[in-house]
Each structure stands twice: as structure tokens, then as C-alpha cells.
Interface confidence: low
Amino acid sequence: NQDLPVIKCVLINHKNNDSSVGKSSSYPMVSESPEDLGCALRPQSSGTVYEAAAVEVDVSASITLQVLVDAPGNISCLWVFKHSSLNCQPHFDLQNRGVVSMVILKMTETQAGEYLLFIQSEATNYTILFTVSIRNTLLYTLRRPYFRKMENQDALVCISESVPEPIVEWVLCDSQGESCKEESPAVVKKEEKVLHELFGTDIRCCARNELGRECTRLFTIDLNQTPQTTLPQLFLKVGEPLWIRCKAVHVNHGFGLTWELENKALEEGNYFEMSTYSTNRTMIRILFAFVSSVARNDTGYYTCSSSKHPSQSALVTIVEKGFINATNSSEDYEIDQYEEFCFSVRFKAYPQIRCTWTFSRKSFPCEQKGLDNGYSISKFCNHKHQPGEYIFHAENDDAQFTKMFTLNIRRKPQVLAEASASQASCFSDGYPLPSWTWKKCSDKSPNCTEEITEGVWNRKANRKVFGQWVSSSTLNMSEAIKGFLVKCCAYNSLGTSCETILLNSPGPFPFIQDN
């Protein structure tokens, strides 16, 4: 139909720091090049309906939906969103096109939905449909990076199949141990997918996107280092690629390296070698063993041998599914009020876990440290001596693990009391859990030494919020004690606390704290 106007629908994505957004709802400043939304004529619809490509927006992002109309004469318009009409002010750009804009500031769930734009020009009427939804980050993934050899080159490619596309970086370090921590000056980062310098001491590849950051270390056996007391172990899942690097330095080039799996030489195509001279003219050789997709029969002892160094091995274990191995029995601890103490969980897991420590419905960050024996450890020290239940939770792609801890703080009881018309109750959270005595104060017993044993009921209850035990004792009021002062005392191995209560007729009860 030649009468139909030429329509262009665009999206303008405003960066968060864009101060120009929303200054004029009809003509916001453009902070980024507009993205074409297509605006195709919708077939089989009554009337002329154009449909723009669906727009998915981050929570709190700001966007402008804009329509450019190439049609002669004036236009009038109306926006409709969720059955409400919204003001529409068209204007003309330098090419004399009609421009209609809808600014959405700081996207929220309530702003998601269908935006209908009705346009009336001198020639015809038509409708434009925009669908705006909040971007669903649940569709996102962040997968641990893995390595591939670059075709026809001695270089490694780092790949992470993640959504959205991650930023990949190599993290390189040439010193040993602690100095290779992430923020150390010895660490060099290269934001690229391909790495040619493969002689470094410690090589990791990391991928990051909106979900966080995941890293994979290039497993290395260094023949110049003293072997670990326990054999290094590498876990992989069926189908994952295997990469082990063997590295050796010698005074000259007169040495060679070989890989064996269970005393059989690796097949050609499953290894490649590189060598270079270091600054002090010694020779560095590295020999990579790799399998592009491991199967169960790739399990075994991989041994790197040298004609000039003692050989070293690593145990490669191929598993069908990931796992988390740790003892899940709950553990109870009893510490003094100022004693230094940390909870700790020792575990073996593959792939690497994500974990949290939780206390009283509040989660705390979880750090994990690799041990030499293939195990990892996570410690939690930030309990601030608060008694109760602490939970360690870990998960990876295939497994979940939860472990409960109870922390008891040894301390003298503290007593709180309350009373009603028929009974008086005392509460204490000291530890060990206290025992109770009730005493009556009278003319005969001004020091409150007359013990009450009738009508006393003791119990312990778990205060659910913190998971800590509270002991209570209740005295049912009888005629014999009405109008008297009574004293409840809680005692344990660390001391005694008491509270005195006046048991008068019904009504508010004053409490007299006993020092």
C-alpha cells in the first residue's frame, strides 16, 4: 500500500550516568546510537499494526522507545499502556520526520508490558506495538573456563560458554605460593582469549559476566619443585577437556620430557612441547598432555619424566557427575566468652563449590582455601561470640551440601522475669543450661532462704531465631505465697543470678532486680 508511511522504530539505551535522560519527555538527548527495532507490519491484523522487536531491559535501566515517521503533513498521537492513556507530543527532526518518544526511567516490574502508540496522519491511521519486559537474569549462566589448543599455533585459547558473553582474562604469576594472590604486584592480567606465553609459574584463566567470576588454573607439575607429600589429584567430568602442563628447567638443552599414562606413552596428538631460553641462559621446556574430551578410561596416573630430573606424577580421576565430599554430621562447640575460635569445614569437591555461612537468617561471605592434600577448607570466624546455630551450605553444578554447627558460649546465667495473675516465670540463656531454685522472702526469712518446691515447673526451649537454648522456670501462684516477695535463682558452674518478684493481687507487677 503506497499510502503507508515509512516507519522506523528505535531503542535508545541510556547509560546509568546519563544525566540527560528525561529532561524532556518528548525529546531526550541520545546517549548511545539508537538500535533499530524493526517495526514490521503485522499480518492478519485488523487495521494497520506495526510490531517492534521485543525489548528486554535491565532493572533500573533507562531507555527511550522512539518512532520516526516519514509521512507528509502533521501527525497526532496517543500512547496507551495498561489501559491508561499517556500524553504524546510529536515533533519534527532535521529531515522533517515526525518523532514520537516514550521515556522509561529506571525500569521496574510495573513498567513492563505492552506500549501501544496510536498515530493519526493526514493520510492514514496506524498502531505501533512495543513489548517491554524486564531482562530475566535467571537465563544467565557463568560456566567455568576451559582450554583448547589454538589451531597450528603453540598457544592456548580460553573458552567460557556463558550468557551474556563473558569477558575472558588470563591471570599470570611468576613467583611461588602466597605472592600469587589476586591483588599481588607479581600478578599480571591480560584481557584476551589467546595466550602465547605458556612458560609462567602459575597460569589461570578467568571469565566474568553479570553473575560473577569463575577461574580455571592450568594444572602444572614442576619437575624443579620438591614434590608434594601427597600425590596431586585432578578431577574432571566425562566430556571435559584435560590439560596438564609439565615444566622443567635445566642448565642446557640436553634433556627431554615425556608423558606416560599408567606406564604407557601418550599417543601422538595428545601432547605438544615448547621450549625457550630464560634470562640466565637456562633452558625451559614445557610438555602439555591434553585430551579434548575425557572418557572414563582416561583415569589414571599421569607421569612426566625427564632425562635430567626425577619424574613426578598426578592422579587424574574422571567422574560421571560432580561431587562434594565432606562429613555432614552436626558439630557442637562450647567456648569461653573471649576465646578465639573458628568453625571450619574440610571438603573435597569438583567442580569448585559456591558456599555461604548463615547465622540467624543472615548470610556471610564464604572463603575457601586449597590444601596440599587435594582437600579444601572453609573457615568462619566472624561469629562475634553469639551463641546459636550456624549453617555452612555449599553447592556446585551437580551436588549440594549442608552442615550444621551449634555454638555455645560459657557464661553465668542472666535472669529475666515476668508475672501474671496466676504465675511467675523466670528465663535464662546462660550456658551450661542453668538449674533453678525458688525462695520465699518473709518475716521469718528476710534473706529469702525459705525454699519453694511446690508448683515449680522447669523447661528448656529452643529460641528458634538464633537456635540457642533458653531455660525457664515457672512458679504457679498459691494462696500461701500471694502478696510475698519471691526470688528465682538460676545457677551453673560459672555463677548464679537471681530476680525478685512481688506476687501481689492481679495487676502490673513491679520487678526488683537483685544485685
Epitope: E35, L37, A53, V55, E56, V57, D58, L139
Partner: nanobody, 125 residues
Framework: EVQLLESGGGLVQPGGSLTLSCAAS????????MGWFRQAPGKEREFVAA????????YYADSVKGRFTISRDNSKNTLYLQMNSLRAEDTAVYYC??????????????????WGQGTLVTVSS
Amino acid sequence: EVQLLESGGGLVQPGGSLTLSCAASERTFSSYTMGWFRQAPGKEREFVAAMSWSGGSTYYADSVKGRFTISRDNSKNTLYLQMNSLRAEDTAVYYCAAGGSTRVVVTTTPVVKYWGQGTLVTVSS
């Protein structure tokens, strides 16, 4: 890796009904946009219907609107396609698909990450 297994295909007369099911292997099923595509002999694979991860949004090809209904049960990791008033032109291999947008701001079509093997639906008298 999500494995998708379709079932429920078969021979049905024009005007008849059929329900296809798609069982997903992964417990993260509920985080994927799920959909149905079909491929008739000698034709390209075409979109039939899709449903957002929460079930809050559904999308249909014009050719099946009003006749087909997509639904999902996240607790059973299963996607369904209820097909009523079937026509001869609905004959095709029906594929279950899982995926989601990789775009940061604009999504024109979901990027399908995983496909099922397909189940054949034949509408014939």
C-alpha cells in the same frame, strides 16, 4: 547440559487433538524460556509457541493462535503443547527447545541453546 525428550506425537485425524510433552533433564529447567518449533517435510524449521521461564508470557505463531496452548510444570521439569482442531498443514516433526536471550537490552528472538530430538505429528484422514 539440558537434555530434552519429546513424547505424545502420532497419527491423528483432521479436527482431532493431541498433547505433546517435553521432559527436561535439568533441575534448572525453570530458568529457561521454553518453546516448540516444527519442521514439515521439505520446509524450514518454524516457530510454533514459547513460554517464559515463569510462565508469565506466552508467544504463538499466527498459524496456531487459538488452536494450540503451551504450558509448563516447573515442578515436573515438563513443557506441554495442547493441539486442538488439527489440520493437515500441522503435519511435521515437533521439536522442544530451551533457551534465553543473550542480548543485554534488546531481544528480537530467544537464542535456542538446546533442542530435543523431535516427535512426529501426522494429521491425515
